[in-house]
């Protein structure tokens, strides 16, 4: 009779849990005429075997991580050996048991970031693997910080994204953080399968050495400027510099000024490009903005401030 | 309907030879191994040639051995017999039948007389 | 070889009568043994394979049992249909052996 272990020799797949001792048969195959027993092929690694009545079982314990899937044919020969039905592919596969621990790939990182750097950008990645199925909660991983050394206020400057492990700062961070107060910090960082969300998950730890570096964009100290110049212009009036090479410049008007007499260049250097006059306008206030090379800004933009000294340039009036 | 027509049957004189045809329809032909069974009034029936699917494999008792040779032409779902050096006691119907799921189908069969 | 010696080599009956066909393996055969019908035109047909599993579309008069040596067919209450020549046939080893025929004729 057929039934769910017994049946026909045609095309299978059936699904085993790895680290199980064998308590039952995975399938009967039923000969039909004249196959008098069978054979079987494949990736059998010496676990998988087929009596001659057609019995296939496994002799030892499966390991996944070994090899998730067993290619497996069987064919049904006669007494003289010749094959009479099949060869059929028969798959095993091999499923996932929490049975590996996570591990970092390093046991200590070091990584360094900007102070006023934005809050939620990566500035390092802990990487940790696990050899169970990614697509079970076996192997997916859960990172967390543990400890952060020195803790301030008890306030924490430093997060991590718990599926992907890159570490950015936090809003405290971005605004607390001062390489002239604390230039480095210490975190311990955890990483633990089952997706982090049972007691039954396997854990590893790693140290993360963090220093804290000088953000060098500062609004500049205010520029004072004598009216009507007769220098040649432009004339350089101040600078702003982002943290690293390669940073996109611009000025930004948000008087909407009928005649903006400023540029900047891709070195940060900014100009008056005109004589300036003080009776006209006493004082001009700006922006600095730095950017990527897509166009999307790098921090917040500078107010640059702009004064105009006056000259005894006009007579006096009764 | 499973059908299988044997030709090619007739008259032949003792040493000499002749060819049979299987044309097979109404099954996945590619997929069973397939034989020639032959009858005579004297030894009843009697396996004479196994071939595998594919044409791999064939299979000869002793008494016709390096005389008849099994083929077979999957895409025309054609088996054949080539008879050579026949013999008076090679006088029969031949039939071809299934050997996967052993003779569960049978021709019509096709006499061959070898005599002088 | 194995020789299959099959009994009787013929019988007369009646329909309705109940008729049994044996069949001895000059050895043990594991069940590996087949019953054919072939019909007085010359048709050739497979009844029961490996002992006692019928074809499909076989009436459930005809069934068949033995193991090791001695197998045996029956037909419950024969049919005007059944008046055949029936042979059995091992598959245990090679080559492939046939009885000798049971030919069923009208009393």
């Known amino acids: 009779q057929e039934g769910k272990f017994s049946g026909p020799l045609k095309p299978m797949t059936f699904s085993i849990y790895e680290g199980q001792e064998p308590s039952q048969i995975i399938f009967q195959f039923k000969a039909n005429p004249p196959a008098v027993t069978f054979e079987l092929t494949g990736e059998t690694d010496n676990i998988f075997v087929i009596e001659r009545e057609g019995l296939l079982y496994y002799n030892r314990a499966l390991d996944r991580e070994t090899r998730s899937t067993h290619n497996l044919q069987v064919a049904a020969l006669d007494a003289n050996g010749i094959i009479v039905e099949g060869p059929v592919p028969i798959t095993i596969k091999v499923k996932d048991i929490n049975d590996n621990r996570p591990t970092f790939l390093q046991s200590k990182y070091e990584g360094s970031v900007r102070q006023n750097s934005r809050p939620g950008k990566p500035f390092l990645y802990v990487n940790a693997t696990d050899l169970d199925d990614p697509a079970t909660p076996n192997g997916q991983l859960y990172y967390q910080i543990v400890i952060q050394l020195p803790m301030i206020n008890n306030v924490m400057y430093f997060q991590i994204n718990n599926k992907t492990g890159a570490i950015s700062l936090t809003r405290e961070g971005s605004q607390e953080l001062n390489p002239a107060k604390n230039p480095s910090y210490n975190l311990v960082i955890s990483v633990k399968d089952m997706g982090g969300q049972s007691e039954n998950s396997f854990s590893d730890t790693t140290s993360v050495d963090i220093i804290v570096t000088e953000n060098i964009w500062k609004a500049p100290k205010p520029v004072e400027m004598v009216e009507n110049s007769t220098d040649p212009h432009p004339i350089k009036i101040t600078q702003v510099r982002w943290n690293d090479p390669g940073a996109q410049y611009s000025l930004v008007d948000k008087e909407k000024l009928p005649r903006f007499p400023f540029s900047i260049d891709q070195e940060g250097d900014i100009y008056v490009t005109q004589p300036l006059d003080r009776e006209e306008k006493d004082a001009y206030v700006f922006y600095a903005v730095a950017k990527d090379e897509y166009g999307k800004p790098l921090s917040y933009p500078l107010e640059i401030h702009v004064k105009v000294k006056d000259i005894n340039d006009n007579p006096p009036t009764c | 309907e499973v059908q299988l027509v044997e030709s090619g049957g007739g008259l032949v004189q003792p040493g000499g030879s002749l060819r049979l045809s299987c044309a097979a329809s109404g099954f996945t032909f590619s997929s069973y191994a397939m034989s020639w069974v032959r009858q005579t009034p004297g030894k009843g029936l009697e396996w004479v040639a196994v071939i595998d699917s594919n044409g791999g494999s064939t299979y000869y008792p002793d008494t016709v051995k390096d005389r008849f040779t099994i083929s077979r032409d999957n895409s025309k779902n054609t088996l054949y017999l080539q008879m050579n050096s026949l013999r008076a006691e090679d006088t029969a119907v031949y039939y071809c039948?299934?050997?996967?799921?052993?003779?569960?189908?049978w021709g019509q069969g096709t006499l061959v007389t070898v005599s002088a | 070889d194995i020789q299959m010696t099959q009994s009787p080599s013929s019988l007369s009956a009646s329909v309705g009568d109940r008729v049994t066909i044996t069949c001895r393996a000059s050895?043990?055969?594991?069940?590996?043994l087949n019953w054919l019908q072939q019909k007085p035109g010359g048709a050739i047909k497979r009844l029961i394979y490996t002992t006692s599993t019928l074809d499909s579309g076989v009436p459930k008069r005809f069934s068949g049992s033995g193991s090791g040596t001695d197998f045996t067919l029956t037909i419950s209450s024969l049919q005007s249909e059944d008046f055949a020549t029936y042979y059995c046939l091992q598959y245990a080893s090679s080559p492939f052996t046939f009885g000798g025929g049971t030919k069923v004729e009208i009393k």
């Open positions: 050895q043990d055969i594991s069940g590996y």
């Open positions: 039948s299934s050997y996967t799921n052993l003779g569960a189908y």
